[in-house]
């Protein structure tokens, strides 16, 4: 079987998710469900996949939902907000998923993998 | 340091066609979307066209589809714009830009050529 | 098609600030980008991803970008700021580039 995917492909491959997300909006991604912002910083995916993880039968999303998972070391699941330092602030997933695409393309320039 | 540079441009009658140049320099061509984009006298920035790294996506302004074909030859590090049935709108500057990120056509254009001017006139 | 306005002038005294607009339908859900072009030179980029500065572009040049409008701040404007300022975004409902019209900054005195 092949081995582990280098973390520069990986993060390659999530930023060209996003990407399509974000390129192929035709109308309100996820019928314009709220999610909670997160701080980009240490534990970044980990607090992503558990904000979006509560967003459900959005299909947009549910390849970003299984890549993000594994960059998370642990199991995440709806209702799971230990990453999540601060709740105080809702936005659009279409916010949320340009967010984090900006910030993982800063990343990548810097050749921040993990 | 990165460097394009246009050529191909010139005065070309209602009808005619010409193929514009872009030779590339600097970075690594292939990893980079670019694109055309065009400034008629006095007037604003028009999007023309772009090309997707690998050259598998291309994309076209309504104004010349049909009419224009984007196309790049990597291994020369060079970008063409193929001009058919000109038109005197097609009258302008055109500039070739690369885009600053490997993905998709979301990004700005971080560097600029210093355009090639083509005259569309009988 | 997408739609991008821009207001066709601007004009500030030196030292105080600039702020250009660029109008359009949820452009907060967009990625901005700015672009500089003096007379009879090609276009500069100097905000990109909404509010980043390629290196090489002084901290006075900063971008904001929510609802319905982004926005190209200059602050300290010097007379060297004088040119045209595009904005810029894809639009991914029909697969295009587009420009806004463009601003003319001009520096009083």
């Known amino acids: 079987s092949p081995g582990p995917v280098p973390p520069s492909t990986a993060l390659r491959e999530l930023i060209e998710e996003l990407v399509n997300i974000t390129q192929n909006q035709k109308a309100p991604l996820c019928n314009g469900s709220m999610v909670w912002s997160i701080n980009l910083t240490a534990g970044m995916y980990c607090a992503a996949l558990e904000s979006l993880i509560n967003v459900s039968g959005c299909s947009a999303i549910e390849k970003t939902q299984r890549m993000l998972s594994g960059f998370c070391p642990h199991k995440v699941s709806a209702g799971q907000f230990s990453s999540l330092h601060v709740r105080d602030t809702k936005i659009e997933v279409a916010q949320f998923v340009k967010d984090l695409l900006l910030h993982l393309k800063k990343l990548f320039r810097e050749g921040r993998f993990n | 340091e990165v460097q394009l540079l246009e050529s191909g441009g010139g005065l070309v009658q209602p009808g005619g066609s010409l193929r514009l140049s872009c030779a590339a320099s600097?970075?690594?061509?292939?990893?980079?979307?670019m694109s055309w984009v065009r400034q008629a006298p006095g007037k604003g920035l028009e999007w023309v066209s772009a090309?997707?790294?690998?050259?598998?996506?291309?994309y076209y302004a309504d104004s010349v589809k049909g009419r224009f074909t984007i196309s790049r030859d990597n291994s020369k590090n060079t970008l063409y714009l193929q001009m058919n049935s000109l038109r005197a709108e097609d009258t302008a500057v055109y500039y070739c830009?690369?885009?600053?990120?490997?993905?998709?056509?979301?990004?700005?254009?971080?560097?600029w050529g210093q355009g090639t001017l083509v005259t569309v006139s009988s | 098609s997408y739609v991008l306005t821009q207001p066709p002038s601007v004009s500030v005294a030196p030292g105080q600030t600039a702020r250009i607009t660029c109008g359009g339908n949820?452009?907060?859900?967009?990625?901005v980008h700015w672009y500089q072009q003096k007379p009879g030179q090609a276009p500069v980029l100097v905000v990109y991803?909404?509010?980043d500065r390629p290196s090489g572009i002084p901290e006075r040049f900063s971008g904001s970008n929510s609802g319905n409008t982004a926005t190209l701040t200059i602050s300290r404007v010097e007379a060297g700021d004088e040119a045209d300022y595009y904005c810029?975004?894809?639009?991914?409902?029909?697969?295009?580039?587009?420009f806004g019209g463009g601003t003319k900054l001009t520096v009083l005195g």
């Open positions: 830009a690369k885009a600053d990120f490997w993905s998709g056509t979301l990004w700005g254009f971080d560097y």
């Open positions: 600097g970075f690594t061509f292939s990893s980079y979307a």
């Open positions: 090309i997707s790294g690998s050259g598998g996506s291309t």
């Open positions: 949820n452009i907060g859900n967009k990625i």
């Open positions: 991803d909404d509010s």
């Open positions: 810029q975004v894809w639009d991914s409902s029909s697969d295009h580039v587009v």
